[in-house]
């Protein structure tokens, strides 16, 4: 499109140049040009020029009716044939843009990522508007009434220095473009209850050459935080269903999880946590690789129902991924496995 | 208490520049979004603009590619620059906190008259 043209008449757009996806619209062109009784008006949509549904109005105006209008975006512009002139006279253009009003934004979340300094809200957005759609969301403290509000194309981070005055928050998200406007639901934030803790890595595995091969996971986080539950996932990587082992986790030292698994397999682990009691999960940590060495003696192995020696595990349950050819792209599709915790994170994609 | 003062207002013709102020005291500006809003004569409010504490704009159809919204934390002073004006722009315009919405809150306004 043409932000600027020097126009020799006039281009106006019914019902505007911004309307709703499959509206009847129609485009009028008025030209006037010096020194010209143009024989034809002819209208062009991107550069290619239209044939049908075109009504000369008068001397100096014609329109173009389209039926159903549903492109997201088009430049229009219209010329006239005058007497004499070997080429079109350019009369005047337009971007037009058709689209949706806003849904309602839905699952507004907000976690603050320990140590980021930010408090981040997500949202879903709905369907595509394919017009230029804002989000303003409004975080209003339920202590002292102040509210602030912030723009956003689809999430947002709060410094937590502007949510100094209070810890408990309303926040809620009003979608806003040119044909339309809706708030999300309301979201009550207790600022010490939507800490997630700093990342959880494995940093290494080893199988020993006990009797029975064991294999210890090592892994830590930089958190702060005192109560941490979290959860451990594992399964081979030619195995579709997951293995999930829980623990109570103290980040003062780095953590050792012992696992009983197939030997001379490719397994691949990942851990996730949250605070003790709250509702927000980490994502799954990066996917860790590790080769079991091979056994010695013949033996059928069942990693699900093996003895689990350490002491705070407390329950295994077993999740299916997408697909066994694609390892980095697995995903929980279950959420009835984790007791009484909600469904926040259980969608969380690898990779 | 909230106190904003408008001004900046004045005659100008098709396709000129004016450049409005609002001074804001009373609230922690810094932490504040901000908008103007105009009233044409015998014509509802208007929402023109907004913009949060971190400098995101927003404007309205009408005026995007025209205006230009900005804020001085220092100065406690919002800003509109109108640029390439047209006679339909001809209005009382009013600076409000908030991002959106047609409402203000009873400040005294500035007059834009665009005329030949």
């Known amino acids: 499109g043409i932000t600027s043209i020097n126009c020799s008449g006039d281009m106006w757009v019914e019902p505007g140049e911004i309307f709703q996806m499959g509206m009847n619209v129609s485009i009028y062109c008025q030209e006037a040009l010096k020194h010209c009784r143009p024989r034809n008006l002819y209208f062009y949509k991107n550069g290619f020029k239209e044939e049908f549904d075109i009504t000369r109005i008068n001397r100096t105006t014609a329109r173009i009716w389209y039926k159903g209008f549903s492109e997201p975006h088009a430049y229009m512009h219209c010329t006239a044939e005058c007497p004499g002139h070997f080429q079109e006279t350019l009369i005047c253009g337009k971007d037009i843009s058709s689209g949706h009003p806003p849904d309602a934004p839905s699952n507004l979340t907000c976690v603050i990522y320990e140590y980021s300094g930010n408090m981040t809200c997500t949202w879903n957005t709905g369907k595509p508007t394919y017009i230029d759609t804002k989000y303003i969301v409004h975080v209003k403290s339920l202590e002292t009434e102040e509210e602030q509000q912030y723009l956003a194309s689809s999430y947002v981070k709060i410094s937590t220095d502007s949510l100094q005055g209070s810890r408990k928050y309303l926040v809620w998200v009003q979608a806003v473009n040119s044909l339309g406007m809706e708030n999300s639901q309301q979201l009550h934030v207790h600022l010490d209850d939507i800490v997630i803790p700093s990342a959880s890595i494995i940093s290494r595995a080893e199988t020993t050459n006990d009797t029975v091969p064991k294999t210890i996971v090592y892994w830590k986080s930089k958190t702060m935080i005192e109560k941490v539950f979290c959860e451990m996932r594992y399964k081979t990587t030619t195995n579709q269903t997951w293995s999930v082992k829980e623990f109570d986790a103290n980040f003062t030292y780095v953590q050792q999880s012992e696992f009983y698994l197939e030997p001379d397999s490719k397994y691949v682990f990942q851990v996730r946590c949250q605070e003790t009691g709250k509702r927000n999960w980490q994502p799954w940590s990066s996917p860790f690789v590790h080769q079991t060495s091979q056994e010695t003696g013949k033996r059928n192995w069942q990693p699900w129902s093996s003895p689990f020696v350490h002491q705070t595990s407390q329950t295994v349950s077993q999740v299916t991924a997408k697909s066994s050819h694609e390892p980095q792209k697995m995903e929980m599709l279950s959420a009835t496995i984790f007791r009484g915790h909600p469904a926040s994170g259980n969608h969380q994609d690898i990779g | 208490q909230v106190q904003l003062q408008e001004s900046g207002g004045g005659l100008v013709q098709p396709g000129g520049s004016l450049r409005l102020s609002c001074a804001a005291s009373g609230f922690t500006f810094r932490l504040s979004a901000m908008r103007w809003v105009r009233q044409a004569p015998g014509k509802g409010l208007e929402w023109v603009s907004g913009?949060?504490?971190?400098?995101?704009?927003i404007y309205a159809d009408s005026v995007k590619g025209r205006f230009t919204i900005s804020k001085d934390n220092a100065k406690n002073t919002l800003y509109l620059q109108l640029n390439s004006l047209k006679t339909e722009d001809t209005a009382m315009y009013y600076c409000?906190?908030?991002?959106?919405?047609?409402?203000?809150?009873g400040s005294q306004g500035t007059q834009v008259t665009v005329s030949s």
């Open positions: 913009i949060d504490s971190r400098g995101s704009t």
């Open positions: 409000a906190q908030g991002v959106y919405g047609d409402t203000y809150s």
